[in-house]
């Protein structure tokens, strides 16, 4: 969480941002809130990105003002116009690109004053893993698959029964480049599994951590997946 204060001859207002991550090819949100104003026409929101000559987005007098928008963001940004009056300056970023990563500034002017806060935005690819029993294998084998990751993650297997065990000798992980030549499909195979045990396939890079669990008993198979974005700090 980053909280910024304006330092100004006018007064300063508090602006708060939250560091976040974007999944390339999908839409992302850059979060920013501020002390609201009574009149929408008195609020100016500017999103800036370090090293960029144009603006990411500008909203003023109740509408978008995109004459100064940088080419790299053209047609890809929007604020939640109906929520600006209550202090929401968050930005929707469409079709997140790898090059969208960097430091952004949410800069606000209202009748009360001005303020800004920076936001670290990471970009990559992350997806839920699915763990299945590989019935084609000669021994009891689990197969963990996740369709889209970038940068290349690490994959670690764990088991509820053998806590702390190192499965690197009995597992094999491969990374297959997807058709767009950036993201990769992750496949990890775990051999010599035993029934009545819960196994976890943990995939992690510097952006996200995902876990796929599978519980195999003689009568049933239970699966669960979980994905967590890393480094979501507020500013």
């Amino acid at each position: 969480l980053i909280i910024g204060f304006g330092i100004s001859g006018r007064h300063s207002i508090t602006v708060t941002t939250v560091a976040s991550a974007g999944n390339i090819g999908e839409d992302g949100i850059l979060s920013c809130t501020f002390e609201p104003d009574i009149k929408l026409s008195d609020i100016v929101i500017q999103w800036l990105k370090e090293g960029v000559l144009g603006l990411v987005h500008e909203f003023k007098e109740g509408k978008d003002e995109l004459s100064e928008q940088d080419e790299m963001f053209r047609g890809r940004t929007a604020v939640f116009a109906d929520q600006v009056i209550v202090g929401n300056a968050s930005l929707r970023l469409k079709n997140v690109q790898l090059t969208d990563a960097g430091t952004y500034k949410c800069y606000i002017i209202t009748s009360k004053g001005k303020g800004n806060a920076n936001l670290e935005y990471k970009t990559g690819a992350f997806s839920m893993p699915e763990v299945n029993v590989d019935y084609n294998a000669s021994s009891e084998t689990l197969r963990c698959e996740a369709p889209r990751w970038f940068p290349q993650p690490t994959v670690v297997w764990a088991s509820q029964v053998d806590q702390g065990a190192n499965f690197s000798e009995v597992s094999n992980t491969s990374f297959e480049l997807n058709s767009e030549n950036v993201t990769m499909k992750v496949v990890s195979v775990l051999y010599n599994v035993t029934i009545n045990n819960t196994y976890s396939c943990m995939i992690e890079n510097d952006i996200a951590k995902a876990t796929g669990d599978i519980k195999v008993t003689e009568s049933e198979i239970k699966r669960r997946s979980h994905l967590q974005l890393l480094n979501s700090k507020a500013s």
Epitope: R10, Q46, E50, G51, V52, L53, D70, K105
Partner: antibody
Framework: EVQLVESGGGLVQPGGSLRLSCAAS????????MHWVRQAPGKGLEWVSA????????RYADSVKGRFTISRDNSKNTLYLQMNSLRAEDTAVYYC?????????????WGQGTLVTVSS | DIQMTQSPSSLSASVGDRVTITCQAS??????LNWYQQKPGKAPKLLIY???NLETGVPSRFSGSGSGTDFTFTISSLQPEDIATYYC?????????FGQGTKVEIK
């Protein structure tokens, strides 16, 4: 220590060419837009050109458009200004300056300047 | 292009005096104005950004105010080391433009 050091200035004839360099150190070069600003002898400051951190976007003053080209090599932490078809009125000290966020930060670090003299 | 008009073009004041320089933009530039100090033979130095924010390490006797088209730069108590030329610069839109400068001298 954050530093910008210009080089490449000198005496050139009207119509000639010159390439200025600006070597950056002490900061993450590709996070900053970079600018060239010039100052004719005894005169004020004039903005010349700007380039984005990734080099993909550029801007020029009307007085140099079509004659000057700004570029950067982020692997070498170096900014360039290629000056062609030079005129007497281009005579000035040329400064490079960095700019992290457009509009709200200003040029917080400047080089010491390099003198370009256009004369026959 | 946005024209920046600075006044006065020069001034002479005593040590300890309050010095005020104004800068007028030809159109609304919101808060997007910076102030620089340039000493003879040296590169400019950023003092104030975003109209009123004091750059890190700059003495608190320097201040800036204003928005829209009219801006003011103030030295609350002039010191001998403040002898320099001061420039305003608009950062609202390209091409970026500077005022013509105000030369400050000691009486």
């Amino acid at each position: 220590e954050v530093q910008l050091v210009e080089s490449g200035g000198g005496l050139v004839q009207p119509g000639g060419s010159l390439r200025l360099s600006c070597a950056a150190s002490g900061f993450t070069f590709n996070s900053y837009a970079m600018h060239w600003v010039r100052q004719a002898p005894g005169k004020g400051l004039e903005w010349v050109s700007a380039i984005s951190g990734n080099g993909g976007s550029t801007r020029y003053a009307d007085s140099v458009k079509g004659r000057f080209t700004i570029s950067r090599d982020n692997s070498k932490n170096t900014l360039y200004l290629q000056m062609n078809s030079l005129r007497a009125e281009d005579t000035a000290v040329y400064y490079c300056a960095r700019d992290r966020f457009r509009k709200v930060h200003g040029f917080d670090v400047w080089g010491q300047g390099t003198l370009v003299t256009v004369s026959s | 292009d946005i024209q920046m008009t600075q006044s006065p073009s020069s001034l002479s004041a005593s040590v300890g005096d309050r010095v005020t320089i104004t800068c007028q933009a030809s159109q609304d530039i919101s808060n997007y104005l910076n102030w620089y100090q340039q000493k003879p033979g040296k590169a400019p130095k950023l003092l104030i950004y975003d109209a009123s924010n004091l750059e890190t390490g700059v003495p608190s006797r320097f201040s800036g105010s204003g928005s829209g088209t009219d801006f003011t730069f103030t030295i609350s108590s002039l010191q001998p080391e403040d002898i320099a030329t001061y420039y305003c610069q608009q950062d609202a839109t390209f091409p970026l433009t500077f005022g013509q400068g105000t030369k400050v001298e000691i009486k």
